[in-house]
């Protein structure tokens, strides 16, 4: 069974998938469609890297631009380095500026919804 066939079989169960499952899926050429991606738990999407999202979505990654103001894409963008977002070739804006350090302060982030940044 190839990645696409596997994805069709598990698609209806993905809404509650944890980050670990999404990371594993990203290695299997599943080409998740945007509609499915938009239904994923925000907390599961946030830890994914740009490279992992690109592998997870395949050609569907082109649809991120139209969804950049909507959750979970909006919140995910805020967590990524702008340099990494730029590699997607979609003009996505709102990432962590180059030269900034991301402090993983869980309580701060839980309260504000955004990571704590330390300037250059």
């Amino acid at each position: 069974m190839n990645g696409s066939e596997y994805f069709v079989k598990i698609q209806s169960f993905l809404g509650g998938a944890p980050t670990e499952d999404l990371k594993a899926l990203s290695q299997q050429n599943v080409s998740m469609d945007l509609a499915t991606f938009m239904k994923l738990r925000t907390d599961a999407v946030l830890p994914l890297t740009v490279a992992e999202v690109q592998k997870l979505l395949g050609p569907h990654v082109e649809g991120l631009k139209a969804e950049e103001r909507h959750r979970p894409v909006r919140d995910w963008i805020l967590r990524q380095r702008q340099d990494d977002l730029d590699t997607l070739g979609l003009g996505l804006q709102g990432g962590i500026p180059n030269g900034y350090l991301v402090l993983d302060l869980s309580m701060q982030e839980a309260l504000s919804g955004t990571p704590c940044l330390l300037g250059p």
């Epitope: 469609d33 945007l34 690109q54 050609p59 569907h60 082109e62 649809g63 631009k65 139209a66 730029d86 590699t87 997607l88 070739g89 979609l90 003009g91």
Partner: antibody, heavy 121, light 107 residues
Framework: EVQLVQSGAEVKKPGASVKVSCKAS????????MHWVRQAPGQGLEWMGN????????YYNERFRSRVTMTVDKSTSTAYMELSSLRSEDTAVYYC??????????????WGQGTTVTVSS | DIQMTQSPSSLSASVGDRVTITCKAS??????IAWYQQKPGKAPKLLIH???ELQPGVPSRFSGSGSGTDFTFTISSLQPEDIATYYC?????????FGGGTKVEIK
Amino acid sequence: EVQLVQSGAEVKKPGASVKVSCKASGYTFTNYWMHWVRQAPGQGLEWMGNINPSQGGPYYNERFRSRVTMTVDKSTSTAYMELSSLRSEDTAVYYCARPYYGSSYGYFDYWGQGTTVTVSS
Amino acid sequence: DIQMTQSPSSLSASVGDRVTITCKASQDINKYIAWYQQKPGKAPKLLIHYTSELQPGVPSRFSGSGSGTDFTFTISSLQPEDIATYYCLQYANPLRTFGGGTKVEIK
């Protein structure tokens, strides 16, 4: 003003390869994927594939996957489409097209003028 | 892939006539369809996107409607300059597909 300027007409022999260029101007080249569409004489439009201009990752229509190569040169804001093992059925006008990402995956709002490729022995 | 079935493939109408072209998608594409006009030797020109949104500068005699799988493109009063081939495009999927085209001629 957004412009996509393509290379000139080509005449090729069967079995040869052709490389068509598309030079973009008037916008940030790395903010929009570039797509290629072809049109055989008297026929409809056929999507061939696209390429991420920032890191060069292409996605191809399955029909062309074994013969097409899409590349970009960021330094000159130019996209290229190379088609190999040409046959007479590849005689067509080849267009580059830029999408507008207003909704979903984006529709094409700007097109190159087209490059005519003739395959003849 | 999503197939787009466009009909008719050609039509002949008189100046002032109402002209209707349809596109049927092989699966639900919401409202993600665009319509293009192409004249001989020219690149396609975008007329309508998101089913019914007219591009700036496009005459109001052009309109579109539909959702899901069935879509309609209408020229309310055909003009001589409208002689062209018209195509629909689905962009609900990253692997874009066009309808087969409709050639519009004057009687």
